[in-house]
Amino acid sequence: KSEMPQPVSIQDINHRVWVLQDQILIAVPRKDRVSPVTISLISCRHVETLEKDRGNPIYLGLNGLNLCLMCAKAGDQPTLQLKEKDIMDLYNQPEPVKSFLFYHSQSGRNSTFESVAFPGWFIAVSSEGGCPLILTQELGKANTTDFGLTMLF
């Protein structure tokens, strides 16, 4: 099991990258002046206490920014949020911190990220550009839930 976060670059199948704008992650077309965030991911060390068939449970952070992706309810709807948190603190916790965990599932070159706290909800971007990342239950419709990962360094 890795004990250091792995830096990755993420883009969707429409070649849009993740950019931080006013503490919100948005997906925009890759252009010269766009500087995508580098995502850090690390596997949960308590993998044996989580469901085994949904993917690899991981924490997702923004490299060097002390911000991590998490899921929380807003009303009755789960939402995707960025929270100030050290990814290694999450990694070292005595239990899986489910609100910050995602099942990372790979099929060929495509990756999906399903919320551990809210099973059936996936990180997604709207088919239109320049939209914030969201959580959705609607797979392959108006939202894109498939992403490509490129390992860095």
């Epitope: 044996e48 206490t49 989580l50 469901e51 929270k83 070292n92 916790q93 005595p94 239990e95 911190v97 489910k98 609100s99």
Partner: antibody, heavy 121, light 109 residues
Framework: EVQLQQSGAELVKPGASVKLTCTAS????????IYWVKQRPAQGLEWIGR????????KFDPKFQGKATLTADTSSNTAYLQLSSLTSEDTAVYYC??????????????WGQGTTLTVSS | QAVVTQESALTTSPGETVTLTCRSS?????????ANWVQEKPDHLFTGLIG???NRPPGVPARFSGSLIGDKAALTITGAQTEDEAIYFC?????????FGGGTKLTVL
């Protein structure tokens, strides 16, 4: 109001088994972890283990492996501790406690009132 | 298995500041031990006071604070009150299990 209500005192014979109950109200046990702790007379606390009621996965202190079984029923919001092959060493008060994440850390925040188990012939 | 040691008893006066400590037999207590502090009052009434070394859950009075002092975890009660008379247990995380201390009986006279 968050509460953990435990079953009443038990007097059982050596070699027998017993199942202790912890019923939660004011929250859904699927949203947290339930820990079990043992307190023997005039001694400190011992961590027995935990269950994640959302998926029934358990972890134990190795010294309670084989002695304790943890289960949960999410439909009744109840967690259970079963103790087998009882001896006088198992005479103690047993507590369930919620191990809950508050955004910065986990806490042993709410506790049951304890179940007194006496093992005697 | 690690042994966690606490003062067996301490006495303080109302309004005074008192510090309880928690030592590990394996060496210095660090933030990776995620020290928790729990209060026990008569009739088996337990309440969690501190988690993750220095975090207080909602509803716990601000006079309770957690920290690391030297190589130990510490619980400080700033301005002790008579209702703080209780037994205080610390618990330390050791990668795959929790170990509790023997408890400190605090008397507020």
């Amino acid at each position: 109001e968050v509460q953990l209500q435990q079953s009443g005192a038990e007097l059982v014979k050596p070699g027998a088994s017993v199942k202790l109950t912890c019923t939660a109200s004011g929250f859904n046990i699927k949203d947290t972890y339930i820990y079990w702790v043992k307190q023997r007379p005039a001694q400190g606390l011992e961590w027995i283990g935990r269950i994640d009621p959302a998926n029934a996965y358990t972890k134990f202190d190795p010294k309670f492996q084989g002695k304790a079984t943890l289960t949960a029923d999410t439909s009744s919001n109840t967690a259970y501790l079963q103790l087998s092959s009882l001896t006088s060493e198992d005479t103690a008060v047993y507590y369930c406690t919620r191990f809950h994440w508050y955004g910065s850390s986990f806490f042993f925040d709410y506790w049951g009132q304890g179940t007194t188990l006496t093992v005697s012939s | 298995q690690a042994v966690v040691t606490q003062e067996s008893a301490l006495t303080t006066s109302p309004g005074e500041t008192v510090t309880l400590t928690c030592r590990s037999s394996t060496g210095a207590v660090t933030t990776s031990n995620y020290a928790n502090w729990v209060q026990e009052k008569p009739d088996h009434l337990f309440t969690g006071l501190i988690g993750g070394t220095d975090n207080r859950p909602p509803g716990v009075p601000a006079r309770f604070s957690g920290s690391l002092i030297g190589d130990k975890a510490a619980l400080t009660i700033t301005g002790a009150q008579t209702e703080d008379e209780a037994i205080y247990f610390c618990a330390l995380w050791y990668s795959n299990l929790w170990v509790f201390g023997g408890g400190t009986k605090l008397t507020v006279l």
